[in-house]
Interface confidence: low
Amino acid sequence: AARPGFQQTSHLSSYEIITPWRLTRERREAPRPYSKQVSYVIQAEGKEHIIHLERNKDLLPEDFVVYTYNKEGTLITDHPNIQNHCHYRGYVEGVHNSSIALSDCFGLRGLLHLENASYGIEPLQNSSHFEHIIYRMDDVYKEPLKCGVSNKDIEKETAKDEEEEPPSMTQLLRRRRAVLPQTRYVELFIVVDKERYDMMGRNQTAVREEMILLANYLDSMYIMLNIRIVLVGLEIWTNGNLINIVGGAGDVLGNFVQWREKFLITRRRHDSAQLVLKKGFGGTAGMAFVGTVCSRSHAGGINVFGQITVETFASIVAHELGHNLGMNHDDGRDCSCGAKSCIMNSGASGSRNFSSCSAEDFEKLTLNKGGNCLLNIPKPDEAYSAPSCGNKLVDAGEECDCGTPKECELDPCCEGSTCKLKSFAECAYGDCCKDCRFLPGGTLCRGKTSECDVPEYCNGSSQFCQPDVFIQNGYPCQNNKAYCYNGMCQYYDAQCQVIFGSKAKAAPKDCFIEVNSKGDRFGNCGFSGNEYKKCATGNALCGKLQCENVQEIPVFGIVPAIIQTPSRGTKCWGVDFQLGSDVPDPGMVNEGTKCGAGKICRNFQCVDASVLNYDCDVQKKCHGHGVCNSNKNCHCENGWAPPNCETKGYGGSVDSGPTYNEMNTALRD
């Protein structure tokens, strides 16, 4: 259905009206209710195309959850039954590297990606004859593209002979998975704001269907990188926005990830949360953090969904989610994707192809262990996919899922035909499963990553590692020179070393004051409206990071602009990554950095460290033999026992799993 105030063809410069035909082996016939697999004949620009569709069984489930709120703000949890949904993926017969994401709920609606063009299709409103409009995505009116992509000609294989049997869906999708050999799973959570909900006529079903459609489109784009999108939850702010959306895109993104960390993660585990907003930000279609997909505090993005189609909007969400997955903008780099603009072009709209640069950026993220949370195949109670043995997702009622019969031949633990464990097996997958057996309790499964982190161990009765926890925010680190913040000890020298190499260190305070008082791209305290904010003297240590003793120039897949400012006998070095207005700047001082006695940086301001809500008296609570973790439980030193570290034991916490195994004392940390 068209959105209120949005005429069906007003956004198109050109379109055709067609009548698709459902195809059976015997004859063409008028459409009938949807099924697991279906084929249609459609016409586009004088040509007939046969499209083969298969229900996207990995997308949604038995246990799909939608969160909404009543008038008084009470959370309502709904499990709509949409197992036999009408969202499909597929390909165009005889067209190499084509892909399709369509819904067949009330007519055909979706995207067809051919070699040289992408088409949108949707039912013609008020037609009783199954008429549809079909249009090139290039013919959708949008802001002029800012495109700096260098498109190399891609050698094209000749199309298969049309008489040849079409490839199976599995073969087709395998053929497209050329980037990384191991499938990654993004557990995506979508949040829809109040204004967008109002714009959809306050119809929760319509919002839900639109977001499922969106997830199907995203899956069809990401599959080329061997990434699957699994929609693990939807929240609609039916009663009012739960964050302040006043201010610039950066403010709203900051508010959203703070809300996510405080309220959403505890309710539903996920890898990335994307906020869908109606409100625009003066030409900024969205904003997201780069490379933060597995971060507790920053794995999110915001996306503006105003008067555009869901097909066009899908490329915006694909772009912002791409940032979370480590992808930088393509502009100014030698990138190609076989189209005139790629998803990660800073101004692209309606693109569906990821570029070679995006693939490389994502590969870098995985090599640097920034994508470890993408390896887990969603658990049955977290993945919303219609249960199906053989889809490599462990669905409700399954104990394991090794995939196709051929893949299952290589799996020693899982019975491929039933998706049950083999008789001798305790487990088939997970960090605490080895050779079909649970690893013994006390086996380290997630090591300590910094002085502000704590290790986790297998518990001996589960294939999964204990949930990740770290030292409580606000605990002193680096010999009292810094505070722990989200598992990292945040201090200036370490940040300088990440950017400028191991010998770099923080510049003197005067550097920060001098440079950050300017309010330009090299020295500022954030962005407000269309201009950089000057730092007040008291906030200068929370603006652009200033370093000295620089001997290496950073390379992060993109070449940043570097500025050197002489100040009182030293050179202050700063950096502008020029990532664009939709990406927070990694050249700024990190949140949680100690900017004075009892003070930390937050939102480019030097504020009282009490905002971290650190409330752990380690002497009283942990008897001086431990620290508090992010669940506010004691993590005891080796030699002392949880929960309060007052009796002898082997360290750890109630959250970490046992640190000791009676059978093997060598397993202790």
Partner: nanobody
Amino acid sequence: EVQLVESGGGLVQAGDSLRLSCAPSGGIISNYHVGWFRQAPGKEREFVAAISASGTSTAYAGSVKGRFTISRDNAKNTAFLQMNTLKPEDTAVYYCAASEYVFRYYDDSRYYAYWGQGTQVTVSS
């Protein structure tokens, strides 16, 4: 754009009472949860009391519980803060704020989109 106007502040003796009012210009107060916050010189702004849009839920900071009462009269398009047994430590600028967000975040100033200019309350001993 909703603008909030506070009134009723002033200078009183310890143990006295005051009634603050909050009225919106350009909006209907029944559409919003209303909160009162205060800021003493050199201190952070702190939550005082809040009332939900329907008036069925109220919440108070521990330091004012039992002494202050928040209420609303939607017919008069006004919210009130009745302050009894005032103490010197109640001295501050009192701000009225309105929120369209979920009421469970009543004590977090980030969730209030609309704010008044504030009214000074001074309690002498």
